[in-house]
Interface confidence: low
Amino acid sequence: QTSVFPPEVILPRGGSVKVNCSASCDQPISLGMETPLPKKEILPGGNNWKMYELSNVQEDSQPMCYSNCPDGQSSAKTLLTVYWTPERVELAPLPPWQPVGKNLTLRCQVEGGAPRANLTVMLLRGEKELSRQSAVGEPAEVTTTVPVGRDDHGANFSCRTELDLRPYVLKLFENTSAPHQLQTFDLPATPPQLVSPQVLEVDTQGTVVCSLDGLFPVSEAQVSLALGDQKLNPTITYGNNSLSAKASVKVTAEEEGTQQLLCGVMLGNQTQETRQTVTIYSFPAPNVNLTKPEVSEGTEVIVECEAHPRAKVMLNGVPAQPPGPRAQFLLKATPEDNGRSFSCSATLEVAGQLVHKNQTRELRVLYGPRLDEKDCPGNWTWPENSQQTPMCQAWGNPLPQLKCLKDGTFPLPIGQSVTVTRDLEGTYLCQARSTRGEVTREVTVNVLSPRYE
């Protein structure tokens, strides 16, 4: 009977082990070991035993001890199991952005490692174990699928191997891959809301607002706003899970016509877009022409209003006949027309909307000077010592200067409150003078003396 000790050994790859072969009889005819491994007999042995050192053990092996005793030949094997940790543990790269609510597949590759029966592969989120599987194949590939939520943004995923040799060597060998950080995002299926004018006049400023709710993480979202080829530069306001991009837009004559307004919200590797049509138009204010802006009373004046060829005009509230871009009328200037406004209103239809422009001109009528009985009475009779205010109003454009003098020197205090005395009595010559000439009028003041009883 041949014995071997130890009957079973677990050792690191490239390691050495001492094995004792012994025979059951005292003086065996022969005693030895058969193995392809490098072996060295450790001397001195005994009559019926030998000790061998096996070195550089690279793989599992079963060296055999044999002995030849008088009662027969026998053999016994020792089982050498080699262990080594994997040479590569690698988590496949994660997508640059992972949509919330979609499952994420984690894939780990493990090269090498033995004994495979004791090798386990785990997929981790941080330190939390998501999946634990045996290493099968070379390289071993392990996958698991996990649901992704908003709270996975920034989470680290990794792969870890465990070579569990307990209780043989009382040791657990761990290899961990480099962690990969996940970036999640949530972009709603609804397109952004775009608020903008449907029509925009050349050389005026409009405001465009693009907003979208339900974004995560909102701080990573990007907004692109463009009108035709013109990229807009929005100010972005971030809310809890929403953003609002506001931009001013000014258009030039070259952009006249129909333009596409585009708002795109980019998050992760996805985009949500909204398009809207904006009609850009040019509409100068109408022209109001007077044959002369300043005329003398009695002069004929032509008032003319002209607008954009496609516009319809109204002159002083009266529509053109037939409706169109031009209207006019004729008037004979009177003093009442001085300072009169002639207003032209033009209406243009742009993309189903009516837009309006106005222009106003004022007529100056030169007349006078005038002194009328109504405004400058020829006779006043006042009691002595009473309080009176002499009134005399001259009319004309330009406004005349008025003087009322008695005997060419004594003035009547027009528009001032005076105490009536005897000195005030008499006839005054009132003279109204402007660049257009002068008119005169006599005004008599009578003073009534009180009666003494």
């Epitope: 939520g149 709270d151 943004h153 950080q181």
Partner: antibody
Framework: QVQLQQSGPELVRPGVSVKISCKGS????????IHWVKESHAKSLEWIGV????????NYNQKFKGKATMTVDKSSNTAYLELARLTSEDSAIYYC????????????WGQGTTLTVSS | DVVMTQSPLSLPVSLGDQASISCRSS???????????LHWYLQKSGQAPKLLIY???NRFSGVPDRFSGSGSGTDFTLKISRVEAEDLGVYFC?????????FGGGTKLEIK
């Protein structure tokens, strides 16, 4: 509006444990994580760790492992921080704050819970 | 751990002045996705910190436009264009590119 309401001040003896709470309202609690921050005179502000309100996953600052335990109760929208084997070093103000998992900033904070450890 | 160093420790200003606070990190805060996860918080006396600016230069909702942030890598700055009385308190910078998340020691903005 978003609010994080923390439990009241605590005065405890050395060696015992304490559990403070943080109740979220005004937003979808499970869409965010809850971070815990310690404010002390000696160390200013220190990040203790983060817990996912959705899955309960945690990530601790190595310094607070064994000292702090974070838990969450989704049904009541409440996160908890338990501090064990208290010493005077643990006397501080503890804040909860709403944030993303790791990358995002803390956009809303609780009012803070003052912990005094004294014999 | 990433060490965040703020300067100055104390910043005396007159109302209406411009204020500038610096924050340096011991490692680059550029994440593999290209972003710098550097944030600024203001803590007023007896209150919890409040978020002012996230990811270097983005103002949180409701924060006045007199606050602005800049920088990249390891050097960052918070500027207040015209200091108002309500701006007084302790300003903290914080990074969330690396775990554990860390804070600066704080800069106290006070009246001269």
């Amino acid at each position: 509006q978003v609010q994080l309401q923390q439990s009241g001040p605590e005065l405890v003896r050395p060696g015992v444990s304490v559990k403070i709470s943080c109740k979220g309202s005004g937003y979808t609690f499970i869409d965010y994580a809850i971070h815990w921050v310690k404010e002390s005179h000696a160390k200013s502000l220190e990040w203790i760790g983060v817990i996912s309100a959705y899955s309960g996953d945690t990530n601790y600052n190595q310094k607070f492992k064994g000292k702090a335990t974070m838990t969450v109760d989704k049904s009541s929208n409440t996160a908890y921080l338990e501090l064990a084997r208290l010493t005077s070093e643990d006397s501080a103000i503890y804040y909860c704050a709403r944030g993303g998992w790791l990358l995002l900033s803390f956009d809303y904070w609780g009012q803070g819970t003052t912990l005094t450890v004294s014999s | 751990d990433v060490v965040m160093t703020q300067s100055p420790l104390s910043l005396p200003v007159s109302l209406g002045d411009q204020a500038s606070i610096s924050c340096r990190s011991s490692q680059s805060l550029v994440h593999s996705n290209g972003n710098n996860y550097l944030h600024w918080y203001l803590q007023k006396s007896g209150q919890a910190p409040k978020l002012l600016i996230y990811k270097v230069s983005n103002r949180f909702s409701g924060v006045p436009d007199r606050f602005s942030g800049s920088g990249s890598g390891t050097d960052f700055t918070l500027k207040i264009s015209r200091v108002e009385a309500e701006d007084l308190g302790v300003y903290f910078c914080s990074q969330s590119t690396h775990v554990p998340l860390t804070f600066g020691g704080g800069t106290k903005l006070e009246i001269k």
